[in-house]
């Protein structure tokens, strides 16, 4: 017999008080956790449930992206009576359970954060013994990953009429401001920032027409730091090629 409950409300961390001995299903997660790329972060998740002395098999699950349907990034299972939750899935080996599900704690540690980890995560617990029940966080916890700028691509490309243009793409969070400097550009030319669709942390700046030979430098900066990279344009005069 499978019995399940979902509360229509989800409480923030440490805000729920139960006066009645008959607990309801609920999950407590903070709305957001912030950490820097390369560091580790802890995603807190605690829960209450109505099965007071349940010690049967249980499964703890974390999903990314969306509740109920999103891909699992972590899963562990604990046998009847056991406090050890044996990891069955840890995406890229970077997810580790910190909490003890037997003590209503599903908190997760994420190692070696990358900007791609910046998304919403949802905890879920499943009972599968004498009691069959499950519960999942509906709103989840947003993992906000910050990062100093990094220039991921800088290039010179041909344009119509034997002209050339330069492209600079950088990533960071907050998204970095990009600026170009180079021959006849003066003291740094600020470029319009255009976050690329589907790549929220990537920004690209273009120099549409390179009129002089020489070194062109792209600088990316945000509140966490700055990064720069250069490209060289040397045209073979009398020919239509270029050396970069």
């Amino acid at each position: 017999f499978v019995r399940t409950k979902i509360d229509t409300t989800e409480n923030l961390l440490n805000t729920e008080v139960h006066s009645s001995p008959a607990q309801r299903w609920s999950m407590q997660v903070p709305p957001e956790v912030s950490a820097e790329a390369g560091d580790a972060a802890v995603l807190p998740c605690t829960f209450t449930h109505p099965h007071r002395h349940y010690d049967g098999p249980l499964t703890a699950i974390w999903r990314a992206g969306e509740p109920y349907a999103g891909p699992q990034v972590f899963r562990c299972a604990a046998a009847r009576g056991s406090e050890l939750c044996q990891t069955a899935l840890s995406l890229h080996g970077r997810f580790r359970l910190l909490g003890n599900p037997r003590r209503n704690d599903l908190s997760l540690r994420v190692e070696r954060l990358a900007l791609a980890d910046d998304r919403r995560y949802f905890c879920r617990v499943e009972f599968a013994g004498d009691v069959h029940d499950r519960y999942e966080s509906r709103h989840g916890v947003r993992l906000h990953v910050t990062a100093a700028p990094r220039i991921v691509n800088i290039s010179v490309l041909p344009s119509p009429a034997h002209a050339f243009r330069a492209l600079c793409t950088a990533e960071g969070e907050p998204p970095p401001a990009l600026a170009w400097s180079g021959p006849a550009l003066g003291n740094s030319l600020a470029a319009v920032r255009s976050p690329r669709e589907g790549h929220g942390h990537l920004v690209t700046a273009e120099l549409p027409a390179l009129t002089h030979d020489g070194r062109y430098t792209c600088t990316a900066a945000n509140s966490l730091g700055r990064s720069e990279a250069s490209v060289y344009l040397f045209r073979f005069h009398g020919a239509s090629g270029a050396s970069t």
Epitope: V2, T4, I6, R63, Y68, E126, A128, H132, R134
Partner: antibody, heavy 122, light 107 residues
């Protein structure tokens, strides 16, 4: 491509047996609970059976309990329904269906096969 | 077993109309309810899960609401391709049960 493909349906006499298969592709089969749902001609949908991702737990509708057996071979990405002691009232299109979200439970069925017709008649 | 009762059994409507189908459970099923669309000769298609979550790829004119025992599926502005039969299904407890279906026909 994510899909489910049933096979094994056909005409069988009352008391006879059939084995339905459902070949899955395009997703991590072993992570998902799988089910069989049937639909008698001109009627509504009826849940038949569910098996958890690891195959450790199986569940049946009372109308088929003791006669039908659900199983899966995760190495072959295939779900089965062994149907014995078939009755006229088992005549239906049989669909296999995947649970939404990788977990043991079927929170909903987000992927369905095209169905295979089982006719029980003498 | 939990009984699922849909109403109406059939409904006639025109393109552009707003249509609401209701589903009532015989006991509290929290939010463990899904809605499916089925066209003749085809497999059902998931529209809504966990009462109000829109399945990926399903047009936003479909929406679900409710919890406990009373649930609704709303189509905000009917399109020609929406004429079909709609089923609700509870996944609160086994045996999973479906409503008897609501046939949506062109007026």
């Amino acid at each position: 491509e994510v899909q489910l493909l049933e096979s094994g349906g056909g005409l069988v006499q009352p008391g006879g047996s059939l084995r339905l298969s459902c070949a899955a592709s395009g997703f991590t089969f072993s992570s998902y609970a799988m089910s069989w749902v049937r639909q008698a001609p001109g009627k509504g949908l009826e849940w038949v059976s569910t098996i958890w991702g690891g195959g450790g737990s199986t569940y049946y509708a009372d109308s088929v309990k003791g006669r039908f057996t659900i199983s899966r071979d995760n190495s072959k990405n295939t779900l089965y329904l062994q149907m014995n002691s078939l009755r006229a009232e088992d005549t239906a299109v049989y669909y296999c269906a995947k649970a939404i979200g990788s977990s043991w439970y079927s929170d909903a069925f987000d992927l369905w096969g095209q169905g295979t017709m089982v006719t029980v008649s003498s | 077993d939990i009984q699922m009762t849909q109403s109406p059994s059939s409904v006639s409507a025109s393109v552009g109309d707003r249509v609401t189908i209701t589903c009532r459970a015989s006991q509290d099923i929290s939010s463990w309810l899904a809605w499916y669309q089925q066209k003749p000769g085809k497999a059902p298609k998931l529209l809504i899960y966990v009462a109000s979550s829109l399945q990926s790829g399903v047009p936003s004119r479909f929406s679900g609401s409710g919890s406990g025992t009373d649930f609704t599926l709303t189509i905000s502005s009917l399109q020609p391709e929406d004429f079909a039969t709609y089923y609700c299904q509870q996944s609160y407890s086994i045996p999973y049960t479906f409503g008897q279906g609501t046939k949506l026909e062109i007026k």
